[in-house]
Structures are given as C-alpha cells and as structure tokens.
C-alpha cells in the first residue's frame, strides 16, 4: 500500500522558519499535492501550497518556497512573524492524490526535544486515507 | 455545473473605492484558490493577485499591492476585489478565474468617471 | 518579474495553413525537481474571457482540439495550430505558471488573411 512521508525541520539560523518535506512512497501517478496546517486539509487545516506536476505551484503565507524536489516529494519552506508564525508543536499535512491510488495524507510536527537545526525522521505518520 | 459570476458593469467616480464580487457555484469554494485579472480595453492581460479561502493571506503583483484588496467570504461562496484612489487606469475588464484557470467569470467591465 | 515575450504581435493567415507563433521568458520556467515547464497558452476571443489552452508547456486541456500543440522548454516556447479554422480567429497569450507574480505575454492576434 502507498505511503506518505513527511518531515519537519526548524532552521538553526532562523527560529520562525521552518522546511517540511514530504514524499509519497507509491507507484502511481502523482496529480497534486497539497500542504497545510493547524490540521488536514478540508478537516480545520490551512492550505499553505497547491503543487501539481504539471499546472505549477501555488503558495500562500506564510509560505516562501514551495517546490519539487523529485517527481514525488516536495519541499516547503515557511517563514512567519506574529500571528502567522509557525510554532514548535504546529502540524503539518501533506495530501497525495496519485492514480489510481487516490488521495493519502500523512500529518508531522517538530518532535518536542527537537535542538534547532535539527528534524525529525521522515516519518510514515498517521496515514490517512481520503478517496 | 461550475459557475463564476460577476457584475457586468461598475461605474465609479475618480478617487472613489469599489468591491467587486465574484460568486462560485457548482464546486467546493473552499477547495480551490481565486486569481484576478485586469484587462485595458485592446490590451493584455495583468495578473493582479490570488487567495485561497480559509487563508488570510493573498498573493499580490507589487503593482497592485497598494491598489487591491483581495477578500473571501466562504458563507456565500464569494471572492471580492476592492480598489481603491480609482483613476482612469483602472478602467478595464476584471476578470476572477478558479484554481489553476480553468473556469473563468464574464469579468466586469469598471469605468472610472471624472 | 518574470518577463514574457511574445511574437509576432499579429498573423494573417488562411483557413487549412499551418502556424506558429513563438513565447520567449526571461528567466527558466523549467521546474528542476520534477522536470517540468510551467508554461500556460490561452485563447481569447472578443468579448470573452480567456481560454485555457496548454499547460505544462505541451499537455491539451480537456476539450482543446488536438491541432493546437505546445512544445519548447526553458525559455523558450512554440504554440502551433497544424490547421487553421475559422473559428481559431483569436488573441493567444502565453503565461508564466512559474513563479510568482504569474505574468502574461501581451498576445499574438490571429487575422484572416
């Protein structure tokens, strides 16, 4: 069965930025991905970015860099001040929607004991299914 | 069926504000982003901005930053765009398009009057 | 800003000719991780809104008539219509879908010769 992978990591140099990374672990298709936050996405969370192959990348604040890092995984780099500010317990979601797979979604946060400038292991976290 | 509609005219007076509107039917408003467009009669078309309902926090081209203000209401499946200090540039078709341009409003023809 | 370029301004042409017009960015709009052009063509007709044509630089939307093809990579990018009808008669512009704010071509006008 596929799997989603994500990856959170606080930047040493700045303590309001933060790259998630996630990767879907599938054969199919990948047709879009969404990123958000404070939640899955549809279910509370905010959308920070829409990234499709092939249409482009969109991104919305505190968003500064989404990207594609392979054909399936992606990078996001948040930086914030006040109010949208990420912080140290936040929760990120990364939403799949491959073919014929459907839609998998895999949430991640900053484990507590994380030291700045390190991250937690790419994890296959809670996977949610959402055909 | 998707649907995107918006005013088909606005007459405003130089220095005055306007908020036009842009309702969504057919499809999830919340799942997809809104752009704006600005078309000058016989010219191109300007990519003025985007926002995704449920973030707070639009896109803007530098050009427009001081001039529009991107909003959403999610209860009625509307997108607004205001402008603000209007003068004869901004008169043009305003068009609202869904997520990646695949459906598109008739736009709203502004005309500013002196 | 990205900026896109587009020739020629104008073409005058007849029903069944092959033509092509050409979209020149300033910067890459080849996407490295995944290898793809995020590069948009659409057609707009008089008193209507744009269409969206191609996107990703060479794939049809839904419902676009195979003899509309987008090729090129990088900066630089081609619409071809292999056949041209009646109906085609139309200003086609090029997008960035790259990166932001998503600048438009100032267009290509299609003419009946």
């Known amino acids: 069965t596929p799997e989603v992978w994500v990856q959170v990591r606080m930047e040493a140099t700045e303590l309001s930025s933060f790259t998630i990374r996630c990767g879907f672990l599938g054969s199919g298709s990948i047709s879009l991905v969404t990123v958000s936050w404070g939640g899955p996405n549809g279910a509370g969370g905010t959308t920070l970015a829409v990234l499709h192959p092939e249409r482009g990348i969109r991104q919305w604040a505190p968003a500064r860099q989404a990207r594609w890092e392979t054909q399936s995984s992606i990078s996001l780099i948040l930086e914030g001040s006040g109010a949208s500010s990420p912080c140290a317990n936040t929760t990120f979601c990364c939403k799949f929607a491959s073919f014929p797979e459907g839609s998998w979604e895999a949430c991640g946060s900053l484990p507590p004991s994380s030291d700045p400038g390190l991250s937690a292991p790419p994890t296959p976290a809670p996977i949610l299914r959402a055909d | 069926q998707v649907q995107l509609q918006q005013p088909g005219a606005e007459l405003v007076k130089a220095g005055a504000s306007v908020k036009m509107s842009c309702k969504a039917s057919?499809?999830?408003?919340?799942?997809?982003?809104i752009t704006w467009v600005k078309q000058r009669p016989g010219q191109g078309l300007e990519w003025i901005g985007d926002?995704?309902?449920?973030?707070?926090?639009?896109n803007y081209n530098e050009k427009f930053k001081n001039k529009a203000t991107l909003t959403v209401d999610t209860s009625s499946s509307t997108a607004y765009m205001q402008l603000s200090s209007l003068t004869s540039e901004d008169s043009a078709v305003y068009y609202c398009?869904?997520?990646?341009?695949?459906?598109w409003g008739q736009g709203t023809t502004l005309t500013v009057s002196s | 800003d990205i900026v896109m370029t587009q020739s020629p301004s104008s073409l005058s042409v007849s029903a069944g000719e092959k033509v092509t017009m050409s979209c020149k960015s300033s910067?890459?709009?080849?996407?490295?991780?995944?290898?793809?052009?995020?590069l948009a063509w659409y057609q707009q007709k008089p008193g209507q809104p744009p269409k969206l044509l191609i996107y990703g630089a060479s794939t049809r939307e839904s419902g676009v008539p195979d003899r509309f093809t987008g090729s090129g990579s990088g900066t630089d990018f081609t619409l071809t219509i292999s056949s041209v009808q009646a109906e085609d008669l139309a200003v086609y512009y090029c997008?960035?879908?790259?990166?932001?704010?998503?600048?438009f071509g100032a267009g290509t006008k299609l003419e009946l010769r």
């Open positions: 398009t869904r997520g990646y341009y695949d459906y």
């Open positions: 926002i995704y309902p449920g973030n707070d926090s639009p």
């Open positions: 910067q890459s709009l080849l996407n490295s991780g995944n290898q793809k052009n995020y």
């Open positions: 997008q960035n879908d790259h990166s932001y704010p998503h600048t």
């Open positions: 057919g499809y999830t408003f919340t799942s997809y982003w």
